[in-house]
Amino acid sequence: SPTPFGPEGQLADELHKPKAIQTEVKPSVRFNLRTSKDPEHEGCYLSLGHSQPLEDCGFNMTAKTFFIIHGWTMSGIFENWLHKLVSALHTREKDANVVVVDWLPLAHQLYTDAVNNTRVVGHSIARMLDWLQEKDDFSLGNVHLIGYSLGAHVAGYAGNFVKGTVGRITGLDPAGPMFEGADIHKRLSPDDADFVDVLHTYTRSFGLSIGIQMPVGHIDIYPNGGDFQPGCGLNDVLGSMAYGTITEVVKCEHERAVHLFVDSLVNQDKPSFAFQCTDSNRFKKGICLSCRKNRCNSIGYNAKKMRNKRNSKMYLKTRAGMPFRVYHYQMKIHVFSYKNMGEIEPTFYVTLYGTNADSQTLPLEIVERIEQNATNTFLVYTEEDLGDLLKIQLTWEGASQSWYNLWKELRSYLSQPHNPGRELNIRRIRVKSGETQRKLTFCAEDPENTSISPGRELWFRKCRDGWRMKNETSPTVELP
């Protein structure tokens, strides 16, 4: 098939590039029990059917057991995300068994061959789990399989083949090519464990989608819409590297799922929350910040078990680095009237002032056209905890939607040089915090002066007639 255009082209070439791998036989999968956070430490290899290594390596039968499953590799050595994940698991769950599933011989192949090997690797993990189940005190319910990329589908096979039901599978940006749209028994699916949660960070609706786009778990979380991750843009990557490449951008976005999971382990006090929504566009409009009826959840390790009958797609925004948590706000702005607007589409900017901190000036992303005499909903997010909101500063600019509109505006201005000023009339802003679920209404500071021209400021303070709009049932998630 032809190589897709765009940034993924290079990686697509890599997927199909022949690779001479000197391997005489295909040895079995290895299970490396990581007994230390230390990257120098060699760990301990478990052997199916041999109980002595379990004792020698200090395998704790009653503790949680994590199996980390890597994906396709071009290098034949474990990348450092694996070390970070091992270290984070040891930090968070001190008594847990952390096992790295080494299937490098079967993953250091052409991508297509590695895909064809996922089933046999899943079977090997299932056999190991079946053997462990024969031991006293070992419970499959305490097993958590964590698979990255191709490893997520390996985890799916393992969960499918094992006798009984694995406690949890976390899919970290499960691989897309050759799995998108596949039958549930040939990819990760909700049937593979008691709880299957998935983070999608590199999905593309055009070109090659390295990560799978479709929901494959009980909850499927799409940070930043599941596509363009902050801090992974070409400028960010090139800016931090002597010689950056598109491949680095791909790696940054694909691997972001792992770092979000690591963040959830080590920054327990700064949990990120995701909100159920039917699609990314609706989330960007700010209409999905509800925690009612299990509509919100922590992401990563702290996710609460939700066994939905259907897949639940959830969204959130994040920072560019750890800690990834941001604070989401829904803003409802009722635009009462336009004055002399012509073809110009307004772009709003808000600055939020709180008891703890003030935000930067934040643009309100326009997903759909601003409606006159209607309530327009927006999503804004801040990197810092502002505390209780006290006031809001609003400005707007006339952003032309096209060169044609810009020309029309210029022509209109030249024909009527004394064109009266363009104005919007905004009397109040309603705000809902995603993290606290608190609702507030902000009224114009001067009720007699609610018209605003481009570049001018309008100030809003908490309305005197009570700020709590209406009671909402308390969140089902333990919110901070």
Partner: antibody, heavy 120, light 107 residues
Framework: QVQLVQSGAEVKKPGASVKVSCKAS????????IHWVRQAPGQGLEWMGH????????NNNEKFKDRVTMTRDTSISTAYMELSRLRSDDTAVYYC?????????????WGQGTTVTVSS | DIQMTQSPSSLSASVGDRVTITCRAS??????LNWYQQKPGKAPKLLIY???KLHSGVPSRFSGSGSGTDFTLTISSLQPEDFATYYC?????????FGQGTKLEIK
């Protein structure tokens, strides 16, 4: 104790090939990767590539492209590095070094080095 | 490739001195920095790995610190056997790269 013992010095003509061996002992050969690092006279250290003895998978520094071939024989716990189409600037001491399972694992044990001289 | 730059390239010091060698990476290497000591005609020896962890058998006068792109190796009190060349190496990204070395000589 962990030991890596390399083959003796070699003198080669330009265009020829050289094969250096590295015999491991004191640990399970397939549990660590073997890397090759060279050092030209009076110069610094340069990573050439590695082999995963567990299954023979390799990864080379792009600089050496198709000139370097790494193999291993698990029955005698020995890794090999062959450098072909030798040039005078390949004159260097070639070291094998053991490394753990991650990128970040350090080169914790080194061979004594093999001097390769390329001269017409 | 990630460039590793050591400074100084050489320095003279006396027994008992406190010595600091710095290493700068061309990008963030997530603390995956290792230090080696090499004496003339010998293979390098691992001193410190993962920025600050001391390899077994290495005297405690050697210590490492730093984060992001800037790292240091410190010898708290120089001993006669410490006069050698020191190299830093990043283990963050392939290809693995080394600094150009710092030669520590007797004053």
């Amino acid at each position: 104790q962990v030991q890596l013992v390399q083959s003796g010095a070699e003198v080669k003509k330009p265009g020829a090939s050289v094969k250096v061996s590295c015999k491991a002992s004191g640990y399970t050969f397939t549990d660590n990767t073997i890397h090759w690092v060279r050092q030209a006279p009076g110069q610094g250290l340069e990573w050439m590539g590695h082999i995963n003895p567990y299954y023979g998978g390799t990864n080379n520094n792009e600089k050496f492209k198709d000139r370097v071939t790494m193999t291993r024989d698990t029955s005698i716990s020995t890794a090999y590095m062959e450098l072909s189409r030798l040039r005078s600037d390949d004159t260097a001491v070639y070291y094998c070094a053991r490394k753990g399972i991650y990128y970040s694992s350090p080169f914790d044990y080194w061979g004594q080095g093999t001097t390769v001289t390329v001269s017409s | 490739d990630i460039q590793m730059t050591q400074s100084p390239s050489s320095l003279s010091a006396s027994v008992g001195d406190r010595v600091t060698i710095t290493c700068r990476a061309s990008q963030d290497i997530n603390n995956y920095l290792n230090w080696y000591q090499q004496k003339p005609g010998k293979a390098p020896k691992l001193l410190i790995y993962y920025t600050s962890k001391l390899h077994s058998g290495v005297p405690s006068r050697f210590s490492g610190s730093g984060s992001g792109t800037d790292f240091t190796l410190t010898i708290s009190s120089l001993q006669p056997e410490d006069f050698a060349t020191y190299y830093c190496q990043q283990g963050n990204t392939l290809p693995f790269t080394f600094g150009q070395g710092t030669k520590l000589e007797i004053k």
